[in-house]
Amino acid sequence: GIAIPRNSGCPNSEDKNFPRTVMVNLNIHNRNTSTNPKRSSDYYNRSTSPWNLHRNEDPERYPSVIWEAKCRHLGCVKADGNVDYHMNSVPIQQEILVLRREPRHCPNSFRLEKILVSVGCTCVTPIVHHVA
Amino acid sequence: GIAIPRNSGCPNSEDKNFPRTVMVNLNIHNRNTSTNPKRSSDYYNRSTSPWNLHRNEDPERYPSVIWEAKCRHLGCVKADGNVDYHMNSVPIQQEILVLRREPRHCPNSFRLEKILVSVGCTCVTPIVHHVA
């Protein structure tokens, strides 16, 4: 990664794992203070590729609850409300960082973990494979 | 939250902020080993609400690079390639965790931060406000 100039006011670390084990303050700073909470809440229902949200809960993880999107249909919803199977509803996935308690049940020791979550669905034109 | 049963093998913490300041191992464990990374890579182009990905880089953040989706059109793309402005392309947003160096430039001290990122776009029916 980028070499960060060391600040003389930094916490010291003589840890043999330095800098792979770091101190993290869990008092979360939220950068979304200006966000309108009504903004994207009902897209799951109004989308042409609507989805439901399913709970994935794990007390050994931070955050402990993650919501996974599952597309309601294989196809996409047309203006008349019927499903068009010539198009496909597909999940949009994102890799996110979570903290995993390690060792298990330890309240103050974690390991970073990457997990893939489905955030919502989008309607795509299918890839048609032509047989020669 | 729920009191996690303390494991006797846990690292000790006499920090006055305990348990809000924790140790985190940055050797990331990746749970997505079976995922095909190319699987959803072309949805941005094939979607009826296509998007472009813009790089957001910040050396004081971990991960330092985040990709933000921006919808290409206000409307949605029809089968003939034209844009239907009776429908709306909207970003699907996800709240994610990142680590922010705190104090700045410190290599081994971070604060958790929640940020809202746009992951992709979906096509929605607009909300029509009827004037009385």
Partner: antibody, heavy 122, light 108 residues
Framework: EVQLVESGGGLVQPGGSLRLSCAAS????????MLWVRQAPGKGLEWVAI????????YYPDSVKGRFTISRDNAKNSLYLQMNSLRAEDTAVYYC???????????????WGQGTLVTVSS | DIQMTQSPSSLSASVGDRVTITCRAS??????LSWFQQKPGKAPKSLIY???RLVDGVPSRFSGSGSGQDYSLTISSLQPEDFATYYC??????????FGQGTKLEIK
């Protein structure tokens, strides 16, 4: 000890507005999703609004969509429900409840407030 | 939306009896099911979560079981303070969370 205390209920005329508040203590409020659930006299339980920990996402059932707005102030450990265009069928005891998000919980709605009564009548 | 069908709607029993209340979901809810107890004029109180996990402080005579679509709450030996209304809640799929219609447990 986790505590949730609602306030702001009362008698209001149809078409009127009311703002409910819920003061939270005993847990890291900003780590939890919060909900409002209501119970009409002699009836069952119905959720009316939910807001994620950071406040960036909120959801409503069709019965209140466009009339009710949930919000939160994490600095004040407070949850709110702004209710506009009230109808007789909104008469109920309104409870605030907690759900897991960053912090873990005993499932959804593990802790509830004592409730505040909203009566919509002319 | 997932529908929750709770039965029976009312039940008469005596102190010391073993009683079982059931909830059926319209689809698999992956054991994301809670049970609540509500007494008149009071807020609901959480008893069981994740289908079979007892909330701290809840007496061990309460137990939950089930998976997939079918779940039950059992009180092994009824005590006078157990007469109340019981609700199940699915919290797997959202929105919305859905409650059962309630079971009123009365003294015979």
């Amino acid at each position: 000890e986790v505590q949730l205390v609602e306030s702001g209920g009362g008698l209001v005329q149809p078409g009127g507005s009311l703002r409910l508040s819920c003061a939270a203590s005993g847990f890291t409020f900003s780590d939890y999703t919060m909900l409002w659930v209501r119970q009409a006299p002699g009836k069952g339980l119905e959720w009316v609004a939910i807001i994620k920990s950071g406040g960036s996402y909120s959801y409503y059932p069709d019965s209140v969509k466009g009339r009710f707005t949930i919000s939160r102030d994490n600095a004040k450990n407070s949850l709110y429900l702004q209710m506009n265009s009230l109808r007789a069928e909104d008469t109920a005891v309104y409870y605030c409840a907690r759900d897991g998000d960053y912090g873990s919980s005993y499932g959804a709605m593990d802790y509830w407030g004592q409730g505040t009564l909203v009566t919509v009548s002319s | 939306d997932i529908q929750m069908t709770q039965s029976p709607s009312s039940l008469s029993a005596s102190v010391g009896d073993r009683v079982t209340i059931t909830c059926r979901a319209s689809q698999d809810i992956n054991s994301y099911l809670s049970w609540f107890q509500q007494k008149p004029g009071k807020a609901p109180k959480s008893l069981i979560y994740r289908a079979n996990r007892l909330v701290d402080g809840v007496p061990s005579r309460f137990s939950g079981s089930g998976s997939g679509q079918d779940y039950s709450l059992t009180i092994s030996s009824l005590q006078p303070e157990d007469f109340a209304t019981y609700y199940c809640l699915q919290y797997d799929a959202f929105p919305p969370y859905t409650f059962g219609q309630g079971t009123k447990l009365e003294i015979k």
